[in-house]
Interface confidence: low
Amino acid sequence: LIIGFGISGRHSITVTTVASAGNIGEDGILSCTFEPDIKLSDIVIQWLKEGVLGLVHEFKEGKDELSEQDEMFRGRTAVFADQVIVGNASLRLKNVQLTDAGTYKCYIITSKGKGNANLEYKTGAFSMPEVNVDYNASSETLRCEAPRWFPQPTVVWASQVDQGANFSEVSNTSFELNSENVTMKVVSVLYNVTINNTYSCMIENDIAKATGDIKVTESEIKRRSHLQLLNSKAS
């Protein structure tokens, strides 16, 4: 969490941002909140990005003002116009690109004063893994698949029964480039699995960590997946 204050003494307002990550090809949110004002027409929101000549987005007098918007963001940004009056300056970024990563500033002007806060935005690809029993294999084998990751993640297997065991010798992981030539499909195979055990396939890069669990018993198979972004810090 980053909290910024205006620089002009008593004419300052608190602006708060939260570092976040964008999943390339999908829509993302750059979070920013501020002390609300009673009049929408008195609120100016500017989103800026370090190293970019034009603005990322500007909202003033109750509507978007995009005459100074940089071409790399054209047609891809929007604020939640109905929530600005209650202090939400968050930016929706459509079709997140790898190049959208960087440091952003949420700059706010209201009748109470000015304030700003920076936000670190990471971009990459991350997806939920699914673990299945590979019935085609000659021995008891589990197959963990996740369709989109970038940068290349690490894959680690763990087991509830054999806690702390190193499965690198009995697993094989491959990365297959997807058609857009950026993200990759992750496939990891674990051999010699035992019944009545819970196995976890953990995929992690510097943006996200995802886990796929599978519990195999004589009578049933239970699956569970979980994904966590690693850099959600507020400012």
Epitope: Q46, K49, L53, G54, E68, D70, E71, Y107
Partner: antibody, heavy 121, light 107 residues
């Protein structure tokens, strides 16, 4: 140490063309916007053109729009200014400058030594 | 377009004097103003940005002030090395505009 070294200036006839280059070193060139600024003999500074770090966005002063083109080659750490349809009033020392983009707080923190362009018949 | 007007055009002062240069914008520019120093035959050098922030390595005798339409550059104690022309500059996302310059001479 940041260094900017302009070249390509010289004498050219009205209506002619010239290409200025600026070789950059001492910093990650592709991370910075760059600008050209000129100064006519005995006169003040005039901003000419700017380009984003990636080269995707370019901006021009009204006085050169349609005649000058700014570009960059990030693999060679070089900035260019292609000048066409040159006029006598384009005579100036042309400086390349690193254009610090810190969220709209854009300033020129490093400058080259300049290259003189003279447009005369 | 926003116009920047500096005054005076030329200023003559003695070593140790307090010197003030004014820059006026034709409309409000918030704090988007920088000051540069250009010594004879040299490239300009950044002194102040965002109206009052001192660039690193610049002597503390230089200071900037103002917001909106009126800005000042002050040299608290003029030194022989300060002989130069000083320019103010407005900047926004896509344009840069310089004032016409103020030449500072040493008496």
């Amino acid at each position: 140490e940041v260094q900017l070294l302009e070249s390509g200036g010289g004498l050219v006839q009205p209506g002619g063309s010239l290409r200025l280059s600026c070789a950059a070193s001492g910093f990650t060139f592709s991370s910075y916007a760059m600008s050209w600024v000129r100064q006519a003999p005995g006169k003040g500074l005039e901003w000419v053109s700017a380009i984003s770090g990636s080269g995707g966005s370019t901006y021009y002063a009204d006085s050169v729009k349609g005649r000058f083109t700014i570009s960059r080659d990030n693999s060679k750490n070089t900035l260019f200014l292609h000048m066409n349809s040159l006029r006598a009033e384009d005579t100036a020392v042309y400086y390349c400058a690193r254009d610090i983009q810190w969220f709209g707080e854009s300033v020129f923190d490093y400058w080259g030594q300049g290259t003189l362009v003279t447009v005369s018949s | 377009d926003i116009q920047m007007t500096q005054s005076p055009s030329t200023l003559s002062a003695s070593v140790g004097d307090r010197v003030t240069i004014t820059c006026r914008a034709s409309q409000s520019i918030s704090s988007w103003l920088a000051w540069y120093q250009q010594k004879p035959g040299k490239a300009p050098k950044l002194l102040i940005y965002k109206a009052s922030s001192l660039e690193s390595g610049v002597p503390s005798r230089f200071s900037g002030n103002g917001s909106g339409t009126e800005f000042t550059l002050t040299i608290s104690s003029l030194q022989p090395d300060d002989l130069a022309t000083y320019y103010c500059q407005y900047y926004n996302s896509y344009s840069r505009t310089f004032g016409q310059g103020t030449k500072v001479e040493i008496k």
